[in-house]
């Protein structure tokens, strides 16, 4: 009986490694075989691999690659998911505060208007929220509806409180008169301009963040091609077939393979860079009338000024409307005009704040700075993945896809691959349909971001002046002016108290890529939302 072969002449190590990938050893040869059926790990001599093993290696390699890609994008993905949730909630808080301020203004100054005013204000701010979230609502219509609804109440409760109930069917006429007679002066137009500009920008900002998430989710879940699977197998696993268990791929070789595998993904790079820079431009312009926090939290003051404007012109208006809407006046007009100092209740309208607290605009700038550190994310992916997977340092004594070499030479590796398949072919196939779709979406959002980017510096004031409104003397420091013109303007330091907890308002379980099926998490809410 011949002596048993020495350990390295058996496939013992390969068997024990493969056992971890695929329990059961029926596919692993006991001793090296010719391997004439192999298609990827083409043998230069006897091999410890079989065709079935190759297939398993290919599957494992592709899965491995998907995991590497997902871990590469994890930090970026969390950054955007987290901030999209944070800003959405923060914007909702701003809307809620703005509604409360406006209601407080009515309650303190015009208690007789409150039940109806609260209702109209509520509807207006509900529409504001829906618009920010992408609803197809016209901002001008929202503002018109607010003033159309308010005027009949102001007229019947404040300007003409003696009007008999029977005359209350003049509401429709009063709504029409509101526009025809411009009873609120230029204030509705001022509000339309400010609200539409600030909300448009807010809406596109949120849309852009959500698209960022979609881009990463798309590339995170790319299925790599069979060709790529073969290249990865050759790089990561074919060395095992020769019993070389400890050898690592050459770094240069890894870069070539990754560039081939990721050619489609890297095409996103140009549009991703533009996306981050366009988003930065948008954020830089989100101040004053382009900052919803500033605009919405000042609305109560502008609405208040508009009612004062009506009251100042009450005498003239009552006569004109009396004729226009033909109601019999029971008694002489009595203006319910209050002295100036009652108008702004500083106690109620004061916003709680802490020194140096975080504002939304600083939070936005912080996000952009963090995003900019990922500007080369897609072009750097091949290199990143190679640096986060086992490769030989300095390319010495490493695996080049066919054999153990002292030094990696791209030319030699290419020559050796000629008969296997063409790396260039892999690159020329062009991006996958899903990548093409996401590129189209990025192009579209970049276009939108560019058209929305704000004019800089004094141009902003000039634009406002051309529309016939006072641009005011508010500086661009942290004390932003709130409100429109008139004496009702107050200053609020750092309008929104930006709670630290908001920074973690993240429901990761709703993010794709979670494989825990048995968990009752559908429509669950994060603790940090509550």
């Amino acid at each position: 009986q011949p002596p048993p072969p020495p350990p390295d002449a058996t496939c013992h190590q390969v068997r024990s490694f493969f056992q971890r990938l695929q329990p059961g050893l029926k596919w692993v040869p006991e001793t090296p075989v010719p391997g004439s059926d192999l298609q990827v790990c083409l043998p230069k001599g006897p091999t410890c691999c079989s065709r079935k093993m190759e297939e398993k290696y290919q599957l494992t390699a592709r899965l491995n690659m998907e995991q590497l890609l997902q871990s590469a994008s994890m930090e970026l993905k969390f950054l955007i998911i987290q901030n999209a949730a944070v800003f959405q909630e923060a914007f909702e808080i701003v809307v809620r505060h703005a509604k409360n301020y406006t209601n407080a203004m009515f309650k303190n100054n015009y208690p007789s208007l409150t039940p109806q005013a609260f209702e109209f204000v509520g509807e207006f701010f509900t529409d504001v929220s829906l618009y920010i979230l992408g609803s197809d609502i016209n901002v001008d219509d929202m503002v018109n509806e607010l003033f159309d609804s308010l005027f009949p109440v102001i007229y019947t409760q404040l300007m003409n409180p003696g009007l008999p109930d029977s005359a209350l069917d003049i509401n429709e006429c009063l709504r029409g008169a509101r526009r025809d007679l411009k009873v609120f002066g230029n204030f509705p137009k001022l509000i339309m301009t400010q609200v539409s500009k600030s909300l448009q920008v807010t809406r596109i900002f949120l849309q852009a963040l959500n698209l960022g998430i979609e881009v990463i989710n798309t590339t995170d879940h790319l299925k790599f091609s069979k060709d790529c699977g073969r290249m990865l197998t050759r790089m990561w696993y074919c060395s095992y077939c020769q019993g070389l268990m400890m050898v690592k791929p050459c770094g240069g070789y890894c870069n070539v393979v990754m560039q081939g595998c990721m050619a489609g993904v890297v095409e996103i790079d140009k549009y991703w860079r533009e996306y981050i820079l366009s988003l930065e431009e948008l954020v830089n312009g989100m101040y004053r009338i382009y900052d919803m926090e500033n605009v919405l939290l000042g609305l109560f003051s502008t609405i208040h000024d508009s009612i004062q404007y009506v009251q100042k012109n009450a005498g003239k208006l009552t006569t004109t409307i009396g004729k226009l809407c033909a109601h019999s006046q029971q008694r002489q007009y009595r203006s319910a005009y209050y002295p100036e100092d009652l108008f702004i209740d500083k106690k109620v309208l004061k916003v709680a704040h802490v020194e140096h607290e975080e504002t939304l605009s600083s939070r936005r700038r912080e996000l952009i700075q963090k995003l900019k550190s990922f500007i080369s994310f897609y072009s750097a992916l091949p290199g990143y993945i190679c640096s986060h997977s086992p490769v030989a340092e300095n390319d010495t004594l490493c695996w080049n896809g066919q054999e153990l070499v002292e030094r990696y030479s791209q030319k030699a590796a290419r020559n050796g691959m000629k008969n296997q398949f063409n790396l260039h072919e892999l690159k020329m196939k062009g991006p996958e349909p899903v990548v093409s779709q996401i590129i189209d979406k990025l192009k579209h959002i970049n276009q939108l971001l560019r058209t929305m980017s704000m004019p800089k510096g004094r141009v902003l004031d000039k634009n406002l002046d051309e529309e016939g409104f006072e641009s005011g003397d508010c500086g661009d420091d942290e004390d932003e002016c709130i409100g429109g013109s008139g004496d009702g303007m107050i200053k609020v330091k750092n309008q929104l108290r930006f709670l630290a907890e908001l920074a973690y308002d993240l429901d990761v379980d709703d993010a794709p890529g979670n494989s825990q099926q048995a968990t009752p998490k559908d429509n669950e809410i994060s603790t940090f939302h509550n």
Epitope: Y504, V508, D509, A511, N514, T519, N523, I525, T527, N530
Partner: antibody, heavy 115, light 112 residues
Framework: QVQLQQSGAELVRPGASVKLSCKAL????????MHWVKQTPVHGLEWIGA????????AYNQKFKGKATLTADKFSSTGYMELSSLTSEDSAVYYC????????WGQGTLVTVSA | DVVMTQTPLSLPVSLGDQASISCRSS???????????LQWYLQKPGQSPKLLIY???NRFSGVPDRFSGSGSGTDFILKISRVEAEDLGVYFC?????????FGGGTKLEIK
């Protein structure tokens, strides 16, 4: 499968601190909030707070603010709760549990505060 | 904080009987997304609580269909259609919508 392995029972002196650990196995640690719950015969089950290991975000029950500090180590997939200035009131079984709906709980750690 | 009130404190039953446990919250547990975040757990002596029902009426995987949950807003009920020996222990309701999350005081299901 999903498992939460908690550290062993602790006997501590009043005024001291203790750090309990909860190792997560069988799921992506950074994807799920980890919550901590206290159980005593007198007060029953009480929610202490939560940490999101992915972002480091925390939420606390006001009652336990200053008493409990939640941390997480992404690399070892382990959540920690440190309890400080211990008194006999803090003697209890402490559970870590994985949100959502607390489908998975650790086996509990008994903390006894005694001189 | 939201107070969760469970009744009865103790529920003696015979095996095969139906058992009903009630839980009332001091505030509505309906979220703006339409879901109601109310769970039921069973804890046996020396063990951790085990999830039975989530979001009022959804049985967790592996929970026998003799367990059912119902209710809305602030009033909830856990029913066990035919009590078996393995069902004995303390049942807790729990709300996870208002921070701090809160548990009911527990109902002990025991043999008559």
């Amino acid at each position: 499968q999903v498992q939460l392995q908690q550290s062993g029972a602790e006997l501590v002196r009043p005024g001291a601190s203790v750090k309990l650990s909860c190792k997560a196995l069988g799921y992506t640690f950074t994807d799920y909030e980890m919550h901590w719950v206290k159980q005593t015969p007198v007060h029953g089950l009480e929610w202490i707070g939560a940490i999101h290991p992915g972002s480091g975000g925390t939420a606390y029950n006001q009652k336990f603010k200053g008493k409990a500090t939640l941390t997480a180590d992404k690399f070892s997939s382990t959540g920690y709760m440190e309890l400080s200035s211990l008194t006999s009131e803090d003697s209890a079984v402490y559970y870590c549990t994985r949100y959502y709906s607390y489908a998975y709980w650790g086996q509990g750690t008994l903390v006894t505060v005694s001189a | 904080d939201v107070v969760m009130t469970q009744t009865p404190l103790s529920l003696p039953v015979s095996l095969g009987d139906q058992a009903s446990i009630s839980c009332r919250s001091s505030q509505s547990l309906v979220h703006s997304n339409g879901n109601t975040y109310l769970q039921w757990y069973l804890q046996k002596p020396g063990q951790s609580p085990k999830l039975l029902i989530y979001k009022v009426s959804n049985r967790f995987s592996g929970v026998p269909d003799r367990f059912s949950g119902s209710g809305s807003g602030t009033d909830f009920i856990l029913k066990i259609s035919r009590v078996e020996a393995e069902d004995l222990g303390v049942y807790f309701c729990f709300q996870s919508i208002h921070v701090p999350y809160t548990f009911g005081g527990g109902t002990k299901l025991e043999i008559k």
